[in-house]
Amino acid sequence: MMTGTIETTGNISAEKGGSIILQCHLSSTTAQVTQVNWEQQDQLLAICNADLGWHISPSFKDRVAPGPGLGLTLQSLTVNDTGEYFCIYHTYPDGTYTGRIFLEVLESSVAEHGARFQIP
């Protein structure tokens, strides 16, 4: 029986050009975490395997850093990074748990300020 629950950072926002840490935490179970996948919609970002370490998807290698812990750091954010992110925990013996995070990437306050007071 699956008794665990995934706690996530929920809905978060960050500035364009900045970075953000995506974090999930599995609680209320003694199941062993064997692998955590990080996905954006249907696109794989990274995998952390207990035995093999981290696999970062080649197309994200420049912008994704492993950790802290089982989390994932997204760098050089763009507005296209806005959307849903999923942490998928493979555990033994429970099976799979999934958590969801919604990230909104905002135009930076400096950019907004510059746009507001632009001289024609």
């Epitope: 064997t34 692998q35 794989l44 995998i47 395997n49 207990a50 035995d51 093999l52 370490g53 696999h55 970062i56 998807s57 080649p58 197309s59 290698k61 493979h90 033994y92 799979t96």
Partner: antibody
Framework: QVQLVQSGAEVKKPGASVKVSCKAS????????MYWVRQAPGQGLEWIAF????????TYNQRFRGKATLTVDTSISTAYMELSRLRSDDTAVYYC????????????WGQGTLVTVSS | DIQMTQSPSSLSASVGDRVTITCRAS??????LSWYQQKPGKAPKLLIY???SLPSGVPSRFSGSGSGTDFTLTISSLQPEDFATYYC?????????FGQGTKVEIK
């Protein structure tokens, strides 16, 4: 197109070392891990280790710790595997292979390098 | 270690036949399984990854299925160039291990 070209066949004496090279072209070398697999004559495939050229980190099959050492030279897009303390049962074809986009599988393979250990 | 067991170890088939090869893992590997084809004197070639995904350039007559511990590679209509040895491999833990291979021969 993606290509991995390995160094030529080697004949070594027991106790010696050998260094096999794997030159990559047609893709961004640092974005993909490089794997090494061996195949003894008439036998199946055995994974040795892989290295991530992006940070130089290696992960080994415990069986090959102390036997194989992986390195890369990103400036020339080349991966290396050095095998030490060679024995006759190390005689095999050694393959390099580029890792996959979505995990720890082997997407593109080199042509193989035959290492023969004989006194 | 996760053991991978293929069956059969060899089979004889004719051009046009539907061929099925199975691979069993000693523990749950979800869908972290790949299949390779190897011809004599040549390097292996990736056919399937993540149990059912085909890399670009692999003919659609090849398909993969399964999850957990039981997996299948199917060749829907065997072609002359398909006579080879096929290996499965899990990519879920250290060490990565391969099945012992299935040799597909001409009947």
């Amino acid at each position: 197109q993606v290509q991995l070209v390995q160094s030529g066949a080697e004949v070594k004496k027991p106790g010696a070392s050998v260094k096999v090279s794997c030159k990559a072209s047609g893709y961004a070398f640092s974005r993909y891990s490089m794997y090494w697999v061996r195949q003894a004559p008439g036998q199946g495939l055995e994974w040795i280790a892989f290295i991530d050229p992006y940070n130089g980190g290696s992960t080994y099959n415990q069986r090959f710790r102390g036997k194989a050492t992986l390195t890369v030279d990103t400036s020339i897009s080349t991966a290396y595997m050095e095998l030490s303390r060679l024995r006759s049962d190390d005689t095999a074809v050694y393959y390099c292979a580029r890792g996959g986009d979505y995990g720890w599988y082997l997407g593109v393979w080199g042509q193989g390098t035959l290492v023969t250990v004989s006194s | 270690d996760i053991q991978m067991t293929q069956s059969p170890s060899s089979l004889s088939a004719s051009v046009g036949d539907r061929v099925t090869i199975t691979c069993r893992a000693s523990q749950n590997i979800y869908t972290y399984l790949s299949w390779y084809q190897q011809k004599p004197g040549k390097a292996p070639k990736l056919l399937i990854y993540n149990a059912k995904s085909l890399p670009s350039g692999v003919p659609s007559r090849f398909s993969g299925s399964g999850s957990g511990t039981d997996f299948t590679l199917t060749i829907s209509s065997l072609q002359p160039e398909d006579f080879a040895t096929y290996y499965c491999q899990h990519h879920y833990g250290n060490p990565l291990t391969f099945g012992q291979g299935t040799k597909v021969e001409i009947k």
